[in-house]
């Protein structure tokens, strides 16, 4: 049976709206929930596309609005259609289309031919896409001043660029409890908006924002050491696109150290954790004397998946330790703000030469030189750092 509705189903998840002049909005389309394809044609009263129009069309993959009266597509029009991959807006009345409209979409093709597009910086992104052959862009006409049938590139004098963003930071070292003033300087044409992204800072400082384009200020009040390795980001947008810059505020604090008991892995490991900013220098003592590192006994840092913390974890790695390595291990950590030490006793092997009154007295033996700290370990797999 032929469909007499404004919009008729096509297959299990398509909708076709072609009865001339019957739509002025896409809001409230019936059965829109599972829609993957929407085809709209000959709708001269359909002039605007706002984000509310496509709400509830989360599965939409293909949208065609052609030979209609579309003059404006909101920058956030496709906020609720993240799966959209085919967009055809040809033969409408569009003079421009913001880069924000398609941001976040994985478009495979975009067709804008037959629109009176006006060449301006606001369409610079589109020209770039077309030049770079991205996602099958079809525009055919870009008008500089009046109607014309060829692609008219922006004049060489026209300087279209995203904003330039710079963050000014304190030169002096920052300590726990300080207030830190950051300033974000934005330069560029047709600046629209700018702000800070401070999601990583929760609990690390109290934040006060002030100022507006082109200069935004930020005060981090009563900073803690948790602020280290956390990104403070300033972003800005204009017609051409978005730029952002991130910095990290380094908050100095004294060295601290923690040692664990020796554990046997492929080799022996005395685990440690050290913290401090700047990163502390480390030194090991064995029974009170400086321990000289060798390929048999050395410091090995563990690769951390967490890049947002100052604490470093590692091992004093001992290959093949014997009784001469039994004793007291001390790790000293120091930075300009303080020093710390931690000690642990380790016993790797009984001394075969220790005298026990119950044992028969041996006729002769050669005691091992007890001063050596380089005698040592166990084994290690080829890609377990390290030997």
């Amino acid at each position: 049976a032929s469909c007499r509705e404004v919009c008729c189903p096509v297959g299990p998840s398509g909708l076709r709206c072609t009865r001339a002049g019957s739509l002025d909005t896409l809001r409230g389309l019936r059965g829109a929930g599972n829609l993957t394809e929407l085809y709209v044609e000959n709708q001269q009263h359909l002039q605007r596309l706002e984000f509310e129009d496509l709400q509830g069309l989360g599965e939409l993959r293909s949208l065609t609005i052609v030979k209609s009266g579309l003059r404006f597509v909101a920058p956030d029009a496709f906020r609720f259609t993240p799966r959209l991959s085919h967009l055809n807006l040809s033969s409408n009345a569009l003079e421009s289309l913001s880069w924000k409209t398609v941001q976040g979409l994985s478009l495979q093709d975009l067709t804008l031919s037959g629109n009176p597009l006006h060449c301006s910086c606001a369409l610079f992104w589109l020209q770039r896409w077309e030049q770079e052959g991205l996602c099958g862009v079809h525009t055919q006409t870009l008008h500089d001043s009046g109607p014309g049938d060829q692609f008219l590139p922006l004049g060489h004098n026209t300087s279209c660029g995203v904003p330039t963003v710079k963050i000014q930071m304190p030169n002096d070292s920052v300590e726990v409890g300080d207030d830190v003033f950051l300033q974000c300087q934005v330069e560029g044409l047709a600046l629209q908006q700018a702000d800070w992204i401070l999601t990583e800072l929760e609990g690390a400082a109290t934040v006060k924002k002030f100022g507006d384009l082109p200069s935004l200020g930020l005060i981090l009040v009563n900073v803690t050491s948790d602020l280290n390795k956390k990104n403070v980001t300033c972003w800005a947008e204009n017609d051409v696109g978005r730029a952002e810059v991130s910095v990290q505020v380094s908050v100095s604090f004294p060295a601290s150290v923690h040692l664990g008991l020796a554990v046997e892995q492929h080799h022996w490991c005395i685990p440690f954790s050290v913290d401090g900013q700047p990163a502390p220098s480390l030194r090991w003592l064995f029974n009170g004397s400086v321990l000289n590192e060798t390929s048999f006994i050395f410091t090995q840092f563990l690769e951390s998946a967490l890049t947002n913390e100052t604490m470093r974890h590692g091992c004093l790695r001992l290959n093949q330790p014997t009784h001469v390595n039994n004793g007291n291990y001390t790790l000293l950590a120091a930075n300009p703000y303080g020093q710390a030490a931690a000690s642990v006793m380790a016993a790797f092997m009984d001394n075969p030469f220790e005298f026990n009154p119950e044992d028969p007295i041996p006729v002769s033996f050669s005691p091992v030189d007890g001063n050596s700290t380089s005698r040592d370990p166990v084994e290690k797999k080829d890609e377990t750092p390290f030997g």
């Epitope: 590192e293 060798t294 390929s295 048999f296 050395f298 290959n319 093949q320 014997t322 075969p352 050669s366 091992v368 030189d369 050596s372 380089s374 005698r375 040592d376 370990p377 084994e379 290690k380 797999k381 080829d382 890609e383 750092p385 390290f386 030997g387």
Partner: antibody
Framework: QVQLQQPGAELVKPGASVKLSCKAS????????MHWVKQRPGQGLEWIGE????????NYDEKFKTKATLTIDKSSRTAYIQLSSLTSEDSAVYYC???????????WGQGTLVTVSA | DIQMTQSPASLSATVGETVTITCRAS??????VAWYQQKQGKSPQLLVH???TLAEGVPSRFSGSGSGTQFSLKINGLHPEDFGSYYC?????????FGAGTKLELK
């Protein structure tokens, strides 16, 4: 697979210095100490010293402390040995070597033959 | 430093024969000894580590034994490719030292 690449030969004059290279591939370079071993023609093997590629820390046999200097270039994954004030006694093959799964030299370079001659 | 005294300095044998090379350490080094084979003009190759563990790919006719100060490398039934020089080495701290070597020649 693990490879340690060394140039084949160097001819140097007495009193001069020479810098030999050992380019590592096939493993995490900073995770294993690099060792250097000397072998004079028809003679045995002598351990010269070792270097930690992670931090440049070095240890030498007493005999080679004034003769050899070990260095590292992390970016090119290359270890170097510089031999100074060369005499005929320094004419030898110089090997770089690294431990394998255990603390023994499972991997060796091909060796560089240094000839000290006027 | 730990001295490694290797004997004999040279050895003549025929294909199929069994030979033993010994190494004595100047102090107790537990089982921290490695053995290497070296052919003329080539780099040494690891045969045995930790006194008796065969390195990867080493034929089972090679075997190592010993602990403390006395160690030996035995080749059961010599193959033509086994002729060359053999070195022991302690891996019990630095400085690492090698034995003077044993030259195994075809009789």
């Amino acid at each position: 697979q693990v490879q340690l690449q060394q140039p084949g030969a160097e001819l140097v004059k007495p009193g001069a210095s020479v810098k030999l290279s050992c380019k590592a591939s096939g493993y995490t370079f900073t995770s294993y100490w690099m060792h250097w071993v000397k072998q004079r023609p028809g003679q045995g093997l002598e351990w010269i010293g070792e270097i930690n590629p992670n931090n440049g820390l070095t240890n030498y046999d007493e005999k080679f402390k004034t003769k050899a200097t070990l260095t590292i270039d992390k970016s090119s994954r290359t270890a170097y040995i510089q031999l100074s004030s060369l005499t005929s006694e320094d004419s030898a093959v110089y090997y770089c070597a690294k431990y394998g799964n255990y603390v023994a030299f499972a991997f060796w370079g091909q060796g560089t033959l240094v000839t000290v001659s006027a | 430093d730990i001295q490694m005294t290797q004997s004999p300095a040279s050895l003549s044998a025929t294909v199929g024969e069994t030979v033993t090379i010994t190494c004595r350490a100047s102090e107790n080094i537990y089982s921290y000894v490695a053995w290497y084979q070296q052919k003329q003009g080539k780099s040494p190759q690891l045969l045995v580590h930790n006194a008796k563990t065969l390195a990867e790919g080493v034929p089972s006719r090679f075997s190592g034994s010993g602990s403390g100060t006395q160690f030996s490398l035995k080749i059961n039934g010599l193959h033509p490719e086994d002729f060359g020089s053999y070195y022991c080495q302690h891996h019990y701290g630095i400085p690492l030292t090698f034995g003077a070597g044993t030259k195994l020649e075809l009789k």
